[in-house]
């Protein structure tokens, strides 16, 4: 019961241009090109996009025109391969151009860089931004798409169109305001934070599809949609899962026009059938397309239906479990996951998937046993420790977060993770631990029933960042193992890691702990990052340092920064007091 149009089109590019409209077509092609060729200048991409758009228009006018019957991959790949500096800028990625489709596109996908060597985006003064916005609104917004897309090569393209729409609205409103900065800056901060979160969430979806396959993604989707739409029947959830999988497979595969088009179709279908899906969709379905799709993706869980009987009857107590499992494995396991998830909005998706995997493993074993029913009769008892483990972990960490506050909680995680995987680069450890630490303010405020889905599913997103960054430059077998063995067990795998006893401490380098007056002009966030970078380095030098030792050194460091930033001659203070601090720290840590 797929919603997507299956009819063949003579010209795929004309079909998508007509479906999406010129504005969305151009925006999506720009995103696609920027996500593939992340180092290319903005002007080069705009030129390529304009050429593709003009060609698409000729195909709209006459679908039989030359080259109009070519696939989008062929058309876009040919266009990307015309870039003159491909070899100099991208090295071996240029070899992709010697391949034929579909291998060429696969090659481009493999060269997407999660951590491109690009300068940090510096926000200009508000007046400068507003002038640029008014001078050329179209270029200003294209530049936004380009800069986000090249830094986030897996950003969910139709969602980036939604962000761009909000970005435009912020400038339209705030550049006319009396206090432009007061109006604009909070909006831009919110878009930046939401954008980073959206990028990370989509990166996990793509990793799930690419590293663990369609079945893994579909299982995730069944669990999540069953929690969100517990009144929807299994056939409806299955249909939504099939369509959602197609959408995300397309976006993760660089097929952004098809992805955006199919996402719009899916939103339309959901809204046309909301009576059989969820009572929470009404407001979403009254919004324009981009807002509607975003709203549906974020919609709150519907109320659980009344009169749900115990699952034990069908999945444990019945003597026919093995017959049902053997004759209809996917339907039976899918139904189990659906029924369990719709009853447990209080569980994380990854926990539900662990339970489903445990159930499947038990049936595989028991259905081959002499007395299958006796063997699987206690399978639900095996779930208890799996449920209690994240519950206890979240309880302990929320208590720690409430006791320490976000910054110090992040520091505790920095120490914990640096000791687990000290080989990982310091910037990655800082970035990942800071994000892990944000789970406190994001999730601990929730009541018990919402804590686990909030926390553990968020941690899955953050640990995926660690996995994709580590995959680019692998340095730790333990990280590789936790990242590749099981998608749903990544968090328990990292949680279970103890201090790496094989690690040889890093040589002490005074330069790492030398600070200058420029730290005083940094924002509070940037200053925290400097201090947290130093903390990671300390742990790498002295992995066996106690909490108390590290706390003493960090307290001294904070006092040192505060003192020197108040001094008249800041630079001299940093030079002289810095030497003393390094010496004192070495003594305190026994370096």
């Amino acid at each position: 019961r797929g919603v997507f149009r299956r009819d063949a089109h003579k010209s795929e590019v004309a079909h998508r241009f007509k479906d999406l409209g010129e504005e969305n077509f151009k925006a999506l092609v720009l995103i696609a090109f920027a996500q593939y060729l992340q180092q290319c200048p903005f002007e080069d991409h705009v030129k390529l996009v304009n050429e593709v758009t003009e060609f698409a228009k000729t195909c709209v006018a006459d679908e039989s025109a030359e080259n109009c019957d070519k696939s989008l991959h062929t058309l876009f790949g040919d266009k990307l391969c015309t870039v003159a500096t491909l070899r100099e800028t991208y090295g071996e990625m240029a070899d992709c151009c010697a391949k034929q489709e579909p291998e060429r596109n696969e090659c481009f996908l493999q060269h997407k860089d999660d951590n491109p060597n690009l300068p940090r985006l510096v926000r200009p003064e508000v007046d400068v931004m507003c002038t640029a916005f008014h001078d050329n609104e179209e270029t200003f917004l294209k530049k936004y798409l380009y800069e986000i897309a090249r830094r986030h090569p897996y950003f969910y393209a139709p969602e980036l169109l939604f962000f761009a729409k909000r970005y435009k609205a912020a400038f339209t409103e705030c550049c006319q305001a009396a206090d432009k900065a007061a109006c604009l800056l909070p909006k831009l901060d919110e878009l930046r934070d939401e954008g980073k979160a959206s990028s990370a969430k989509q990166r996990l979806k793509c990793a799930s599809l690419q590293k663990f396959g369609e079945r893994a993604f579909k299982a995730w989707a069944v669990a999540r949609l069953s929690q969100r739409f517990p009144k929807a029947e299994f056939a409806e959830v299955s249909k939504l899962v099939t369509d959602l999988t197609k959408v995300h497979t397309e976006c993760c595969h660089g097929d952004l026009l098809e992805c955006a088009d199919d996402r719009a179709d899916l939103a339309k279908y959901i809204c046309e059938n909301q009576d059989s899906i969820s009572s929470k969709l009404k407001e979403c379905c009254e919004k324009p397309l981009l807002e509607k799709s975003h709203c549906i993706a974020e919609v709150e869980n519907d109320e659980m239906p009344a009169d749900l009987p115990s699952l034990a009857a069908d999945f444990v107590e019945s003597k026919d479990v093995c017959k049902n499992y053997a004759e209809a494995k996917d339907v039976f396991l899918g139904m189990f996951l659906y029924e369990y998830a719709r009853r447990h909005p209080d569980y994380s998706v990854v926990l539900l998937l662990r339970l489903a995997k445990t159930y499947e493993t038990t049936l595989e074993k028991c259905c081959a046993a002499a007395d299958p029913h006796e063997c699987y009769a206690k399978v639900f008892d095996e779930f208890k420790p799996l449920v209690e483990e994240p519950q206890n972990l979240i309880k302990q960490n929320c208590e720690l977060f409430e006791q320490l506050g976000e910054y110090k909680f992040q520091n505790a995680l920095l120490v914990r993770y640096t000791k687990k995987v000290p080989q990982v680069s310091t910037p990655t450890l800082v970035e990942v631990s800071r994000n892990l630490g944000k789970v406190g303010s994001k999730c601990c405020k929730h009541p018990e029933a919402k804590r686990m889905p909030c926390a553990e599913d968020y941690l899955s997103v953050v640990l995926n960042q660690l996995c994709v960054l580590h995959e680019k430059t692998p340095v730790s077998d333990r990280v590789t193992k936790c990242c590749t063995e099981s998608l749903v067990n990544r968090r328990p795998c990292f949680s279970a890691l103890e201090v790496d006893e094989t690690y040889v401490p890093k040589e002490f380098n005074a330069e790492t702990f030398t600070f200058h007056a420029d730290i005083c002009t940094l924002s509070e966030k940037e200053r925290q990052i400097k201090k947290q970078t130093a903390l990671v380095e300390l742990v790498k030098h002295k992995p066996k340092a106690t909490k108390e030792q590290l706390k003493a050194v960090m307290d001294d460091f904070a006092a040192f920064v505060e003192k020197c930033c108040k001094a008249d001659d800041k630079e001299t203070c940093f030079a002289e007091e810095g030497k003393k601090l390094v010496a004192a720290s070495q003594a305190a840590l026994g370096l």
Partner: antibody, heavy 120, light 108 residues
Framework: EVQLVESGGGRVQPGGSLRLSCAAS????????MNWVRQAPGKGLEWIGH???????YYATWAKGRFTISRDNSKNTVYLQMNSLRAEDTATYYC??????????????WGQGTQVTVSS | DIQMTQSPSSLSASVGDRVTITCQAS??????LAWYQQKPGKAPKLLIY???DLTSGVPSRFSGSGSGTDFTLTISSLQPEDFATYYC??????????FGGGTKLTVL
């Protein structure tokens, strides 16, 4: 509206055959185990069998061989094929929806029933 | 197949009375028992499932208890609309199910 409507009942000669239909509306049959239950005049409820979401049919011991349950998901309809009918098969035949795809009970949704009379 | 034995087969009572109907399974069915109410010419209506869970919309004067092999349906204070036939159903032990013989509740 979520409902089940049985049809196909009527008078049939002993030894004859009849195929009953149960058309579902407002939901997808493929998501549920669909049951047939009968009730002879003045008697109690008697479960005949069901077809589950995995398309596996189960029957009461007495019904095996003469009764066959099938379904057509595209028509959103479940069928009960009855062969070698006897006078004691005279009853109202109900279609009932299981709680889930592999459930034998409880049955919250029932059809209105269709009357089958076996007599010469 | 599991046998379900329901008693009594018929029962007379008055409005306001407390009424108890029992159902016994030939082997343990844990808590997998449902109770139905049927009025003449109508399809059965689910009252209780999983032995003691009340179906939404059913008045709270109906309650169920028991597990294993012995189960009870109680109507705490009979109302005029409660005069009907009641059936128990055992389910979940396999992919088959069985109904009890029924209890006809009439006005005294």
């Amino acid at each position: 509206e979520v409902q089940l409507v049985e049809s196909g009942g009527g008078r049939v000669q002993p030894g004859g055959s009849l195929r009953l239909s149960c058309a579902a509306s407002g939901f997808s049959l493929s998501s549920y185990a669909m049951n047939w239950v009968r009730q002879a005049p003045g008697k109690g409820l008697e479960w005949i069998g069901h077809i589950n979401a995995g398309d596996i049919a189960y029957y009461a011991t007495w019904a095996k061989g003469r009764f066959t349950i099938s379904r057509d998901n595209s028509k959103n309809t479940v069928y009960l094929q009855m062969n070698s009918l006897r006078a004691e098969d005279t009853a109202t035949y109900y279609c009932a929806r299981g709680a889930g795809g592999f459930s034998t009970g409880p049955f919250k949704l029932w059809g209105q029933g269709t009357q089958v009379t076996v007599s010469s | 197949d599991i046998q379900m034995t329901q008693s009594p087969s018929s029962l007379s009572a008055s409005v306001g009375d407390r009424v108890t109907i029992t159902c016994q399974a030939s082997e343990s069915i844990n808590s997998r028992l449902a109770w139905y109410q049927q009025k003449p010419g109508k399809a059965p209506k689910l009252l209780i499932y999983d032995a003691s869970d009340l179906t939404s919309g059913v008045p709270s004067r109906f309650s169920g208890s028991g597990s294993g092999t012995d189960f009870t349906l109680t109507i705490s204070s009979l109302q005029p609309e409660d005069f009907a036939t009641y059936y128990c159903q055992g389910y979940g032990g396999s992919s088959t199910t069985t109904f009890g013989g029924g209890t006809k509740l009439t006005v005294l």
